[in-house]
């Protein structure tokens, strides 16, 4: 007989989610208003298009990328949408409270929605490590804690290090990856006998995951350039991201074949490695002066991604309980670090070129920023993991991991799949 949604969660989730939504509506009512300044139509459309690109990345790209499980594809896509919708609302309020609140009201602009979508993207990257092992009520908690932690991290970095929006947001890769991995580490790990097949990928869900990867691949230049301050910076960022992701696709497919004894291409490797270049150049996408450098970074990132996908899943499955196909967490943790290291290397080269020890201070500041991002990610991730382990959330039993039927109504199925 098909498994019903647990009664306790049926009581808890709607009440918890709708109460939270009501609270958000009240906060929006009392503390926000729309930007009253008259925008020109052309500028409005251009600004909206960037936001739209980011929403497509989040809803379709990351939504489908995480949908490769044989029996958890519906939940992956829909839960991602749920988290995105909730995350954007909370991120708009939080960003407003942290940056504008002394003025008494939070002014909502298209840019605030853009920032909020990027903040919510962080949750969608992290959640890949825990999808299938948590219910919606737990995901609500994860959204609230992660968006709050990222918002505060960005504010602290902005105030202490005086970094711009772009540099501030580019810690998202490292932050999201380490947050997700630390949450996964706290959750029950062993998959009971008889459920191993559920965390395997299937052809149609894998195809939809590839679709997600394609959407992310197409729009990654928009993500990396969205927060830069001038047209020339944005243009360079778009070019460099495009070259990097183009090369990482070629590297991913050929590297995947190279890594297999029979020369076969792994779908899982390709899903994540195609994005490798975009993550690796993220921090310094506007600083790279020529295509060949961006392409070299794309190549290195692709190789690291394929290498990671080959050797890390065993360790991640054992230590963190992350299934083989959920490779986004450790992939982004490696590539995010690579991106940050590339930026620090550029600063080091400046130091060497100038022969000025004081520039070394900037290197230390950048290392400080990165360390702060990792520490806050790990601490808030562990806190979230501990919260998710509370009995109040009625987490799915280990035997029900990676099972759509726990959460969805399938009228055509009288019995299990």
């Amino acid at each position: 007989m098909s498994s019903k949604y647990p009664r306790s969660v049926r009581r808890c989730l709607p009440l918890w989610a709708l109460t939270l939504e009501a609270a958000l509506i009240l906060l929006f009512y009392f503390f926000t208003h729309y930007d009253a300044s008259l925008e020109d139509q052309k500028g409005l459309v251009a600004s909206y298009q960037v936001g739209q690109d980011l929403t497509v990345m989040a809803a379709i790209g990351l939504g489908f990328l995480t949908s490769s499980f044989r029996r958890h594809s519906w939940s992956s896509v829909a839960f991602n949408l749920f988290m995105l919708a909730l995350g954007v609302q909370w991120a708009i309020l939080l960003d407003g409270f942290l940056s504008q609140f002394p003025s008494g009201k939070v002014v909502i602009t298209l840019f605030s929605i853009r920032l909020a979508t990027m903040s919510a993207l962080s949750v969608l990257i992290s959640v890949d490590a825990v999808l299938g092992k948590v219910n919606l009520a737990q995901l609500v908690v994860m959204v609230l804690v992660e968006v709050t932690a990222l918002g505060n991290l960005r504010m602290v970095i902005s105030n202490i290090f005086n970094t711009d929006y772009h540099m501030n947001m580019m810690h998202i890769y490292v932050f999201a990856a380490y947050f997700g991995l630390s949450v996964a580490w706290c959750l029950p790990k062993p998959l009971p006998e008889g459920t191993e097949d559920k965390d395997q990928t299937a052809t149609i869900p894998s195809l939809s995951a590839m679709l997600g990867a394609l959407f992310l691949w197409m729009f990654w230049p928009s993500f990396n350039s969205a927060l830069l301050r001038s047209p020339i910076e944005r243009k360079n960022a778009v070019f460099n991201t495009y070259y990097a992701v183009a090369v990482s696709v070629v590297t991913a497919i050929s590297g995947s074949s190279l890594a297999h004894p029979q020369g076969k291409i792994s779908k899982t490797y390709v899903h994540s490695a195609v994005l490798a270049g975009g993550v690796a150049v993220g921090t310094s996408c506007h600083l790279i002066p020529s295509p060949w450098l961006a392409m070299v970074l794309g190549l290195v990132a692709g190789l690291i991604s394929v290498g990671g996908a080959k050797y890390l899943p065993g360790c991640c499955n054992r230590v963190l309980g992350i299934p083989h196909s959920s490779i986004m967490g450790y992939n982004f943790s490696l590539l995010g670090l690579l991106g940050e290291i590339i930026y620090i290397v550029l600063l080091v080269l400046d130091t060497v070129g100038a022969g000025n020890g004081m520039i070394g201070f900037q290197v230390l500041l950048s290392i400080g920023e990165l360390s702060l991002a990792i520490v806050i990610a790990l601490m808030s991730g562990l806190l979230t993991g501990l919260l998710l382990n509370l009995k109040i959330w009625k987490a799915p039993h280990e035997a029900k991991y990676f099972d759509d039927q726990v959460f969805w109504k399938f009228p055509h199925l009288a019995v299990g799949f």
Epitope: E39, D40, K42, G43, A46, S47, T109, L110, F111, R114, S158, N162, T163, D164, Y165, L227, L228, R229, S230, P231, I232, E233, N236, S284, H286, L287, I288, P289, S290, L293, L346, L349, D350, G353, A354, N356, M358, I359, F361, Q362
Partner: antibody, heavy 129, light 107 residues
Framework: QVQLVESGGGVVQPGRSLRLSCAAS????????MHWVRQAPGKGLEWVAF????????YYADSVKGRFTISRDNSKNTLSLQMNSLRAEDTAVYYC??????????????????????WGQGTTVTVSS | DIQLTQSPSSLSASVGDRVTITCRAS??????LNWYKQRPGKAPKLLIY???TLQSGVPSRFSGSGSGTDFALTISSLQAEDFATYYC?????????FGQGTKVEIT
């Protein structure tokens, strides 16, 4: 020729609000970041706020954060500064300035340099009870 | 915030003199430094950006040097119209700051 003309200054009581405007002409306004800079009587220059070419990025000096709001209307070639909760120390001549961008490359990285190459004549704001 | 300290605060010189004004940053700002000139009752004017690049239309007697924390503006042969207040400005961080100014007066 390239020109910036500020308006909206005047005498205002502490705690009240004022809105400054800056009309731009002679250049493609929508392609450039813009700044507000002020100068208190007998004092030096103080940077106040910046807005990027498309209005997305905004930065404020700590002394005005949460009280002042910079905005722009690219269809009308105007820059604005909404000043709320004014204090006596906000008394100054307020200048709007166009951002000048320049970039050069070494073999391994780009460098973006910015300055303010065109300034308005300034508008005086006096906060006094 | 990055503080800029100019020295001297004021100086007296004659037409034809060579004058150097220095600007020191509280932390390294690479070459992200501009110099402005302001005459009484007038708006400032950009002279030099990126520490040493002369803005178009600015006479070649003005030159800038330095990187990291120590910078200098040099006027090789002072002219009557150069008697003004000079400001340095950093654009390294998102919060731009100016030096307190150096007033160049006629002896």
């Amino acid at each position: 020729q390239v020109q910036l003309v500020e308006s909206g200054g005047g005498v205002v009581q502490p705690g009240r609000s004022l809105r400054l405007s800056c009309a731009a002409s002679g250049f493609t306004f929508s392609s450039y970041g813009m700044h507000w800079v002020r100068q208190a009587p007998g004092k030096g220059l103080e940077w106040v706020a910046f807005i990027s070419y498309d209005g997305s990025n905004k930065y404020y000096a700590d002394s005005v954060k949460g009280r002042f709001t910079i905005s722009r209307d690219n269809s009308k070639n105007t820059l604005s500064l909404q000043m709320n909760s004014l204090r006596a120390e906000d008394t100054a001549v307020y200048y709007c300035a166009k951002e000048h961008g320049y970039y050069r490359s070494s073999w391994y990285r780009n460098y973006y340099y910015y300055g303010m190459d065109v300034w308005g004549q300034g508008t005086t704001v006096t906060v006094s009870s | 915030d990055i503080q800029l300290t100019q020295s001297p605060s004021s100086l007296s010189a004659s037409v034809g003199d060579r004058v150097t004004i220095t600007c020191r940053a509280s932390q390294s700002i690479s070459s992200y430094l501009n110099w402005y000139k302001q005459r009484p009752g007038k708006a400032p004017k950009l002279l030099i950006y990126a520490a040493s690049t002369l803005q178009s239309g600015v006479p070649s007697r003005f030159s800038g040097s330095g990187s990291g924390t120590d910078f200098a503006l040099t006027i090789s042969s002072l002219q009557a119209e150069d008697f003004a207040t000079y400001y340095c400005q950093q654009t390294y961080s998102t919060l731009w700051t100016f030096g307190q100014g150096t007033k160049v007066e006629i002896t």
